[in-house]
């Protein structure tokens, strides 16, 4: 039975969406992105204890083997389950263009 | 420019497919899976240094922010990019059945 979203490590310790405010300089984008100049980056951070937000059967296997062989098999990892798109104005060889990136901001998280 | 598959940490140290031999007992499946009784579990293990097998723009952002704020933002994580299916013979209320699981064995890996 899945524990779902109940974090056994305490509030906010388990895999969840975090927002990090970043400038283009922070992101290493200053040389090719013109706008927006600041980004609210949403990313997945936190621990993946047993049965917490398990993405699939593979995550379940990984956790079981991690408990068995912790030095060989790492615990599941907190990663995006889906993404939010974001439009950037970027430099091109011929000028500037608008480009939509579908894999830039995490929308929700799970453990894999 | 992406480094692609060249691991800067030395051979076998970066994110790649590993095979772990496991019994049904190891996997915690002994009470519901009848066959196979042993599984060659393929999973993604290894470090994700900068530009190594970056899955997407999000992974690139995460690595840049990790370098900037290592205590807040973890490095990208080695996870399956795709899966191989596997058929299990499992117990049911009425007997046994064959079930294909599409998300059980990692096929290849990337960093997210």
């Amino acid at each position: 039975a899945r524990n779902g979203d109940r974090c056994p490590l305490g509030p906010g310790r388990c895999c969840r969406l975090h927002t990090v405010h970043a400038s283009l300089e922070d992101l290493g984008w200053a040389d090719w992105v013109l706008s927006p100049r600041e980004v609210q980056v949403t990313m997945c951070i936190g621990a993946c204890p047993s049965q917490f937000r398990e993405a699939n059967m593979h995550a379940q296997i990984k956790m079981n083997l991690h408990r068995l062989k912790p030095d060989t098999v790492p615990a599941p990892c907190c990663v995006p389950a889906s993404y939010n798109p974001m439009v950037l104005i970027q430099k091109t060889d011929t000028g500037v263009s608008l480009q939509t990136y579908d894999d830039l901001l995490a929308k929700d998280c799970h453990c894999v | 420019a992406r480094n692609g598959d060249r691991c800067p940490l030395g051979p076998g140290r970066c994110c790649r497919l590993h095979t772990v031999h496991a019994s049904l007992e190891d996997l915690g499946w002994a009470d519901w899976v009848l066959s196979p009784r042993e599984v060659q579990v393929t999973m993604c293990i290894g470090a994700c240094p900068s530009q190594f097998r970056e899955a997407n723009m999000h992974a690139q952002i995460k690595m840049n922010l990790h370098r900037l704020k290592p205590d807040t933002v973890p490095a990208p994580c080695c996870v399956p990019a795709s899966y191989n299916p596997m058929v299990l013979i499992q117990k049911t209320d009425t007997g046994v059945s064959l079930q294909t699981y599409d998300d059980l064995l990692a096929k290849d890996c990337h960093c997210v």
Epitope: T19, S35, P36, R37, N84, M86, V87, I89, V96, L98 | -
Partner: antibody, heavy 118, light 112 residues
């Protein structure tokens, strides 16, 4: 082609609040920022604030700080601008517009007339 | 706040003739990336504003090539090579270098 459809005209009493909605029809916000501006009768445009993906935190003009709240609900593709403590000088047409950051406002709502009168 | 000043206030034009609108900012809009954070908008009578030019000189999608933007730093110009009857309305420049975003007072273009 995405359109921004705003809620209808409002008549409000001084001291009250108004909440104007802005819905993306024929699509979502698709990764664009949403800015709000207003135009008093016969006057120019005045920027109030904006919100960028993932629509968590808004940026406001100092003039409106503490009186304006901009939010967005991605699930319904709707942005909102709430202005409180209304006074007669807030009588204006309020516009939402999608942009990239604060610039390139390429799609605008039809505008919502808000009249503040006792 | 950056103050945007437009001239002239009103511009009577003859169809087929060129027209030019000036916009001055109280401080430079040239970012260190080499781009000017200035847009031009047209508000036709009874309509919402529409984007003409972004980042100083880039024509927005669907905007006729008779519209062009030029200038750098604090002095900018919007030119219409051959005015058409449908070009009447109020033209606004807008700076997006820093918040609050500010607009010029507008230039009303009308047919003679």
């Amino acid at each position: 082609q995405v359109q921004l459809v705003q809620s209808g005209a409002e008549v409000k009493k001084p001291g009250s609040s108004v909440k104007v909605s802005c819905k993306a029809s024929g699509g979502t916000f698709q990764g664009y920022a949403i800015s709000w501006a207003r135009q008093a009768p016969g006057q120019g445009l005045e920027w109030m604030g904006g919100i960028i993906p993932p629509y968590a935190t808004a940026n406001y003009a100092q003039k409106f700080q503490g009186r304006v709240t901009i939010t967005a609900d991605e699930s319904t593709s709707t942005a909102y601008m709430e202005l409180s403590s209304l006074r007669s000088e807030d009588t204006a047409v309020y516009y939402c517009a999608r942009g990239v950051g604060e610039l390139h406002l390429d799609v605008w709502g039809q505008g919502t007339m808000v009249t503040v009168s006792s | 706040d950056i103050v945007m000043t437009q001239s002239p206030l009103s511009l009577p034009v003859t169809p087929g003739e060129p027209a030019s609108i000036s916009c001055r900012s109280s401080q430079s809009l040239l970012h260190s990336n080499g781009y000017n954070y200035l847009d031009w908008y047209l508000q036709k009578p009874g309509q919402s504003p529409q984007l003409l030019i972004y980042l100083g000189s880039n024509r927005a999608s669907g905007v006729p090539d008779r519209f062009s933007g030029s200038g750098s730093g604090t002095d900018f110009t919007l030119k219409i090579s051959r005015v058409e009857a449908e070009d009447v309305g109020v033209y606004y420049c807008m700076q997006a270098l820093q918040t609050p975003i500010t607009f010029g007072g507008g230039t009303k273009v009308e047919i003679k």
